[in-house]
Amino acid sequence: PRGTQAEESPFVGNPGNITGARGLTGTLRCQLQVQGEPPEVHWLRDGQILELADSTQTQVPLGEDEQDDWIVVSQLRITSLQLSDTGQYQCLVFLGHQTFVSQPGYVGLEGLPYFLEEPEDRTVAANTPFNLSCQAQGPPEPVDLLWLQDAVPLATAPGHGPQRSLHVPGLNKTSSFSCEAHNAKGVTTSRTATITVLPQQPRNLHLVSRQPTELEVAWTPGLSGIYPLTHCTLQAVLSDDGMGIQAGEPDPPEEPLTSQASVPPHQLRLGSLHPHTPYHIRVACTSSQGPSSWTHWLPVETPEGVPLGPPENISATRNGSQAFVHWQEPRAPLQGTLLGYRLAYQGQDTPEVLMDIGLRQEVTLELQGDGSVSNLTVCVAAYTAAGDGPWSLPVPLEAWRPGQAQPVHQLVKEPSTPAFSWPWW
């Protein structure tokens, strides 16, 4: 019976050859004639069984008895031909204790070049070098590349210019790049990549001047190509020791205070800040093409200011040769660290006396003489490292009588012009 002798192959039709371009759909076919129950036909590519082959098997009996001959046809469908599909194809059957393999057929790929890598859209800073990539393959090989910038070839002929990687030393305008792949079958053109030219990161961000509630900063703009800068954006964020904004950290830990500066000048006054407070600032500049990258975070600090108001609720009472004065901390912002209080007192015909009380909020004055100094008045001011705040209005010294509450003088807060001024001492 057919198929039982080793030298006699059951195959009556072997796979043909297919050569085509990528994406082609084709079919390989083999046919065998066997006696008895038809075997399952396996497909080999380069000697390896294809486990997940898209194959169909058709069996036609040549007689009415199961033991008669059968014609078996197996078809292997190749959809969308790829390089990985190429190779030598054979059919394989197991008959009894023997294995039979058909004559080989060949699948080849030959057509227009195929892109493995194409240039991608990206943004670059003006006048900054960058690389673009393009890679194509056949067969047929060789494949030569030709780069185009704004549709203009960058070499006289394919294969004469840069190949897989194009180094661009810098751009001053937004441009398009593509590459052509050439082989014996023709030309394929890649996608067109748009390279958007953004302004360079500003440089030299630095502090120009400082006030307790404002900082003036300046920077040097980077190149922006043919596109003028439209504005620069400055961000400021309160900084804590535990916050961890370091030299290169990209994102602020909280919502920043954002200000826009028209340019030029490349300078901005940041107002409404807290006195004696550390901040971090950064800047980016924008053209019609988009914003530059941010500078690093720059640590800055507003200086201390003087207290904005005088001490509150000053009372001054006299008992014989002693005067007792006490007060409360200013309600107005201190604008820094309170270092203490200065107190000044003066009689009608006596020189003024200035005292540094420190952080206490009361003092007992020893009055000279018999206590008959007339019209004694007292003023108090709070001070920080930046200097003295406004002096309180003069408070007259009231005689104290046992059983009476000490008089308290509620002060007018923050007078626009002092009603009482002391010479500089």
């Epitope: 630095h206 003036e216 640590p299």
Partner: antibody, heavy 119, light 112 residues
């Protein structure tokens, strides 16, 4: 554009005072920055001498503290160096420079004035 | 005060080759804010010093990117990747972490 232009005598007698002027254009010296004096000795060594701040405060190198004074005239947008009791050791090229407020980086410099102390 | 020491005192380089200049500080110039307060100046023949690099590695405006600065808290390097004729002069490192500001002794760059 910011420019610093220096002027002053190139020869000073020992024990006398050295006085130099730095005229600034393109930026008001009372609006910001530190306004520095630096000198360069004949052997190329650089020495920071001190600054006058935009707010009128001063800071001097301790090695010069008793002899140096930096003042300004905001109406003329100029600042000045005065170094008292000079000796031949003070022979140097003197530069004025603008310094950033944070950590004093000096970005614009004057052209330099060579001062010789000799009788 | 912080003492700055530069080496070598002079260096001779072929055009197009790279050059490195070293600088050492007597104390760390790394601030708690993460920045290192070391700068480099170039003084070209007959000119005033000009700022090249601030905060150890930041290029000042207009400075070509063939210049780069690196280092740790006390040891620093200025590298010029492709020396050009216009790079000749004396290079100074300096610290601006604290007053008084101090400078290195300078390194003279010459072309072979």
């Amino acid at each position: 554009q910011v420019q610093l232009v220096q002027s002053g005598p190139g020869l000073v007698k020992p024990s006398q005072s050295l006085s130099l002027t730095c005229a600034v254009t393109g930026f008001s010296i009372s609006s910001g920055y530190y306004w520095n004096w630096i000198r360069q000795f004949p052997g190329q060594k650089l020495e920071w001498m001190g600054y006058r701040s935009y707010d009128g405060s001063n800071n001097y190198n301790p090695s010069l503290k008793n002899r140096i004074s930096i003042t300004r005239d905001t109406s003329k947008n100029q600042f000045f160096l005065k170094l008292n009791s000079v000796t031949s050791e003070d022979t140097a090229t003197y530069y004025c420079a603008r310094g950033w407020l944070l950590h004093y980086t000096m970005d614009y410099w004057g052209q330099g004035t060579t001062v010789t102390v000799s009788s | 005060e912080i003492v700055m020491t530069q080496s070598p005192s002079s260096v001779s380089v072929t055009l197009g080759q790279s050059a490195s200049i070293s600088c050492r500080s007597s104390r760390s110039l790394l601030h708690s804010n993460g920045f290192t307060y070391l700068y480099w100046y170039l003084q070209k023949p007959g000119q005033s010093p000009q700022l090249l690099i601030y905060q150890m590695s930041n290029l000042a405006s207009g400075v070509p990117d063939r210049f780069s600065g690196s280092g740790s808290g006390t040891d620093f390097t200025l590298k010029i990747s492709r020396v050009e004729a216009e790079d000749v002069g004396v290079y100074y490192c300096g610290q601006n972490l604290e007053l008084p500001l101090t400078f290195g002794g300078g390194t003279k760059l010459e072309i072979k």
